[in-house]
């Protein structure tokens, strides 16, 4: 149950996550299972442990084996096992089955191919994408963040797709490749101009000075899985990250929900320790997809706290 298979190619970077989860405050120790020898944490080593991650920079065939990770909470130790296999690079173009990640399906409406395991790495765009060893070229192919989008998907687009990227560790670069199969299926989905469910247009939200406040931007974009749909907050027409107020943050990641079959996203804006000047700002909930952009504006007003003192 708490064992995970991981694989990579020699001379490429491989990063493995401990199959046991924990909290950021828990310490994680890694060991070679056969020898019970501790894996060092110093980054000068080719193989080293970094919290929940075990890093092979780069990997060698001799690194293959079972690794033990122990997640230590103050009162309980959780043990996991990573079964790592490092393969020699193939001289021909074929990617063997044992190097393939899970197959993904797409359709005319949804043709996202995510690059497997990329979230474990420190990489920068753009990704390089290959199909059957050929670099993908043409306007139909768009490398967007950690996935590939194929416009007007056809059955001929089925095949094995390889993403290639560079992992950077303390100024040193390491190549990583990952391959998965893509199949094409018919899907009865559709996409609409975004509909913002919350907040209402020109809504006034009451907040208490000195307290925390949350604003949720929620919008639906159609039926079935959507791509290139997003919700976000702006302050006085500026992105939250550019506004430069650390008390005001967007919740990392967007929650995707399907209500009545509709694909919806929401983004929470968290305001810590509300201040008077926050009442002067204009808060815009933006929802956008391929059809366009919709904006709802919210303003804050002071709510007088009820005096609970006796």
């Amino acid at each position: 149950k708490f064992s995970k298979q991981s694989w990579g190619l020699e001379n490429e970077a491989l990063i493995v996550r401990c199959p046991r989860q924990g909290k950021p405050s828990y310490t994680v120790d890694w060991y070679y299972s056969q020898t019970n020898k501790s894996i060092p944490t110093q980054e000068r080593n080719r193989v080293f442990a970094s919290g929940q991650l075990l890093k092979f920079l780069p990997a060698a065939v001799a690194d293959s084996g079972i690794y033990t990770c122990i997640v230590r909470s103050p009162t309980f130790n959780r043990t996991g096992y990573a079964n790592v296999t490092i393969y020699k690079k193939q001289s021909d173009c074929n990617v063997p089955d044992y190097l393939m990640y899970s197959t993904v399906s797409g359709s005319e409406k949804n043709s996202k191919i995510y690059c497997p395991t990329i979230d474990l790495y420190n990489w920068t765009a753009p990704l390089e994408w290959f199909k059957n060893c050929q670099a993908l070229q043409g306007s139909r192919y768009r490398a967007h963040k950690s996935f590939l989008v194929i416009d007007n998907v056809m059955t001929e687009d089925a095949g094995d797709y390889t993403c290639k990227f560079i992992h950077n560790e303390n100024g040193a670069n390491y190549s990583v490749t990952a391959t998965r199969s893509f199949t094409v299926k018919d899907e009865q989905g559709f996409s609409l101009f975004p509909v913002i469910g919350a907040p209402a247009q020109n809504e006034i939200k009451e907040v208490e000075i000195g307290k925390n406040a949350n604003l949720t931007c929620s919008a639906c974009f159609g039926k079935g899985t959507q791509f290139l749909a997003a919700v976000l907050w702006q302050l006085n027409g500026t992105k939250i990250t550019d506004f430069g107020e650390p008390r005001i943050q967007q919740e990392e990641g967007q929650n995707q929900s399907f209500s009545n079959g509709l694909a919806c996203l929401d983004m929470v804006l968290r305001i810590a320790d509300v201040k008077e000047e926050d009442l002067l700002l204009q808060y815009d909930c933006l929802a956008l997809n391929l059809h366009g952009l919709r904006r709802h504006t919210v303003r804050l007003s002071r709510k007088n706290p009820i005096d609970h003192h006796s």
Epitope: Q21, K23, S25, P74
Partner: antibody, heavy 120, light 111 residues
Framework: QVTLKESGPTLVKPTQTLTLTCTFS??????????VGWIRQPPGKALEWLAH???????QYNPALKSRLTITKDTSKNQVVLTMTNMDPVDTATYYC????????????WGQGTTVTVSS | DIVLTQSPASLAVSPGQRATITCRAS??????????MQWYQQKPGQPPKLLIY???NVESGVPARFSGSGSGTDFTLTINPVEANDIANYFC?????????FGQGTKLEIK
């Protein structure tokens, strides 16, 4: 927001088994780092930790009561159940369930509690 | 078990004054450089409410009048200034070792 509510019998007879249910909302017990614990408080006395259960089904019990306690979770129902066998009048107390959250392990949200009297 | 001893058992403080409650652990509650000690407030007929976690962090929504300090085995909860609605029992609690244990409580009264 996180809420928890305890339910179960208010009166049990000595030697019987007590079953308490904690129904919660605002978090999922399948999310890494989450836990739910049980604490009791006899009338006018201090709090006593009984047990807790973690997201990955790790269970921890108070050693003094371990032989009498069983804690389980139903992630789909957002419920945690505590059973306590061989009840005795000294087990009369208010029983609380609480959420364990944060970067570190501590009870940050508590239910209102349910009072259990053990008497024949 | 880690035994937590609170003192005093009760104290009476005038509004506007400082209240100090101490909690001594029978062994260190340190874990990776962090003190796993919490403070709770409990008013009659209510569940405990978290005030301070990991020795000195004030829980969100708790007034800044409440503060915590200490490390290793000795910890302090300070309320400054005390207000009338601070009348309650205050408990310390450690989560360093199982069983998690609580102090016996300190009853705060207003003069």
């Amino acid at each position: 927001q996180v809420t928890l509510k305890e339910s179960g019998p208010t009166l049990v007879k000595p030697t019987q088994t007590l079953t308490l249910t904690c129904t919660f909302s605002g978090f999922s017990l399948s999310t890494s780092g989450m836990g739910v614990g049980w604490i009791r408080q006899p009338p006018g006395k201090a709090l006593e930790w009984l047990a807790h259960i973690w997201w990955d089904d790790v269970k921890q019990y108070n050693p003094a009561l371990k032989s009498r306690l069983t804690i389980t979770k139903d992630t789909s129902k957002n419920q945690v159940v505590l059973t306590m066998t061989n009840m005795d009048p000294v087990d009369t107390a208010t029983y609380y369930c609480a959420h364990i959250g944060g970067d570190y392990d501590y009870f940050d949200f508590w239910g209102q509690g349910t009072t259990v009297t053990v008497s024949s | 078990d880690i035994v937590l001893t609170q003192s005093p058992a009760s104290l009476a403080v005038s509004p506007g004054q400082r209240a100090t409650i101490t909690c001594r652990a029978s062994e260190s509650v340190e874990y990776s450089g962090t003190s796993l000690m919490q403070w709770y407030q409990q008013k009659p007929g209510q569940p405990p409410k978290l005030l301070i976690y990991v020795a000195s962090n004030v829980e969100s929504g708790v007034p800044a009048r409440f503060s915590g300090s200490g490390s290793g085995t000795d910890f302090t909860l300070t309320i400054n200034p005390v207000e009338a609605n601070d009348i309650a029992n205050y408990f310390c609690q450690q989560s360093r070792k199982v069983p998690w244990t609580f102090g016996q409580g300190t009853k705060l009264e207003i003069k």
